[in-house]
């Protein structure tokens, strides 16, 4: 029962995590204009992995895609790659884990196969979560570097009458969504691996061996292992885990058309 619950919970947590990774990857607010010195700005800039946007105080928002592939920074390309790999691995992991769930019966699939599939999906979730965390962290590091570089530039070349205020960017909402989502996927993967450990040893089917002692007819079954194949039906109770009735509230709140102080 505990194994089923751990497996089911791992699946749900991973599902939420992967949904979060997808959301973070698609979001435009990976980096947002730093408003430390100017809390109410007439023109607000923010950037995502795929496009950059400008929101005017009038409410008009214009987004432009990065229509070049070669002209983009290598780091941005790397972040994109990490996030996409994370999504792909996570999606495959979800697909595998659906069939691995104890509460779902598919033909005469053995528990050992389910254990292997649970482990496979768990590893996939762990790698997926690590990819997302790595991608977000690389982008965050890039932001921090650029932030301090632009801060240094802001205080140079101010000798003339005309001031050119450089736009500085700070962490956007997508980074926090990505970190949390990556963490959840990682936790879900670990839970799947733990569930696999619970499934594997106990669920491995061994044929019972008969030992004939003199004068007695004793059927010896090795302790700790369950006799199943070739010895009648598996009588262990299977509890059905209802993992589909759960609904998760939308956590990410997107900025409204007008954000005022």
């Amino acid at each position: 029962m505990a194994v089923t619950a751990c497996q089911g919970l791992g699946f749900v947590v991973s599902l939420i995590g992967i949904a979060g990774i997808i959301a973070a990857t698609c979001m435009d607010q990976w980096s947002t204009q730093d408003l430390y010195n100017n809390p109410v700005t007439a023109v607000f800039n923010y950037q995502g992995l795929w496009r950059s946007c400008v929101r005017e105080s009038s409410g008009f928002t214009e987004c432009r895609g990065y229509f070049t592939l070669l002209g983009l920074p290598a780091m941005l390309q790397a972040v994109r790659a990490l996030m996409i790999v994370g999504i792909v691995l996570g999606a495959i992991g979800l697909l595998v884990s659906i069939f691995a769930l104890k509460c779902i019966r598919i033909g005469s699939m053995e528990d050992s196969a389910k254990a292997n599939m649970t482990l496979t999906s768990g590893i996939m979730f762990i790698v997926s979560g690590l990819c997302a965390i790595a991608g977000v962290s690389v982008f965050a590091n890039m932001l921090v570097t650029n932030f301090w570089m632009s801060t240094a530039n802001m205080y140079t070349g101010m000798g003339g009458m005309v001031q050119t205020v450089q736009t500085r960017y700070t962490f956007g909402a997508a980074l926090f969504v990505g970190w949390v989502a990556g963490g959840l996927t990682l936790i879900g993967g670990v839970m799947m691996c733990i569930a696999c450990r619970g499934l594997a040893p106990e669920e491995t089917n061994y044929k019972a061996v008969s030992y004939h002692a003199s004068g007695h007819s004793v059927a010896y079954k090795p302790g700790g292992f369950k006799a199943s194949t070739g010895f009648g039906s598996n009588t262990k109770n299977k509890k059905i885990y209802d993992g589909g009735a759960r609904t998760e509230d939308e956590v990410q709140s997107y900025p409204s058309k007008h954000d005022y102080v």
Partner: antibody
Framework: QAYLQQSGAELVRSGASVKMSCKAS????????IHWIKQTPGKGLEWIGY????????NYNQKFKAKATLTADTSSSTAYMQISSLTSEDSAVYFC???????????WGQGTLVTVSA | DIMMTQSPSSLTETAGEKVSMSCKSS????????????LTWYQQKPGQPPKLLIY???TRESGVPDRFSGSGSGTDFTLTISSVQAEDLAVYYC?????????FGAGTKLELK
């Protein structure tokens, strides 16, 4: 087509306050900022501030923060500006305007002339 | 606050001539995010509110005659009327739409000979 109708001219005594209105039509009132601009022969055009009727959020020019109060009534699609402690410096034409692309003002009211008498 | 300086304060031209007026800002009005300049030009005739002519420094508002054009970037901007007409007699203002508080130039008064 957006249209802004402002209230009539006001003659007020020094030290008193005045409240003028700006009735909007032809667009969704709660979706756009209403800005207020002061015009005097001496200082030209000066931006006072704006109100976003959707949530009542305001942003003032620091120069006018203690002088002007912006409000809006969504039920009548009307924006209001109250100017307090009037002095001769406050004698001007006050315009309301709706914002547009590039943080510009595409639609303007006809203006409200405020004359402060001693 | 961003200071907007317009020049000349007034100019007199003959109908049909090309006219240019300048607007300079104390800070750059160019937004790096979309490479647009947040400068607006208005025309104001006596007894009327200002009328929007050009936004984003060079985008002409619909209904504005194509003889009006805006140019410039960063801190230096120009409004050009390719062939002045009698109805263009007015005061022309530039406005900063990049940083609060929004500020206007003192205006350039266009008169006809």
């Amino acid at each position: 087509q957006a249209y802004l109708q402002q209230s009539g001219a006001e003659l007020v005594r020094s030290g008193a306050s005045v409240k003028m209105s700006c009735k909007a039509s032809g667009y969704t009132f709660t979706s756009h900022n209403i800005h207020w601009i002061k015009q005097t022969p001496g200082k030209g055009l000066e931006w006072i501030g704006y109100i976003y009727p959707g949530n009542g959020g305001t942003n003032y020019n620091q120069k006018f923060k203690a002088k002007a109060t912006l409000t809006a009534d969504t039920s009548s699609s009307t924006a209001y500006m109250q100017i307090s402690s009037l002095t001769s410096e406050d004698s001007a034409v006050y315009f309301c305007a709706r914002d547009y692309y590039g943080n510009s003002f595409a639609y303007w009211g006809q203006g409200t002339l405020v004359t402060v008498s001693a | 606050d961003i200071m907007m300086t317009q020049s000349p304060s007034s100019l007199t031209e003959t109908a049909g001539e090309k006219v240019s007026m300048s607007c300079k800002s104390s800070q750059s009005l160019l937004n790096s995010g979309n490479q647009k300049n947040y400068l607006t030009w208005y025309q104001q005739k006596p007894g009327q509110p200002p009328k929007l002519l050009i936004y984003w420094a060079s985008t002409r508002e619909s209904g504005v005659p194509d003889r009006f054009s805006g140019s410039g970037s960063g801190t230096d901007f120009t409004l050009t009327i390719s062939s002045v007409q009698a109805e263009d007699l007015a005061v022309y203002y530039c406005q900063n739409g990049y940083r609060f508080p929004f500020t206007f130039g003192a205006g350039t008064k266009l008169e006809l000979k």
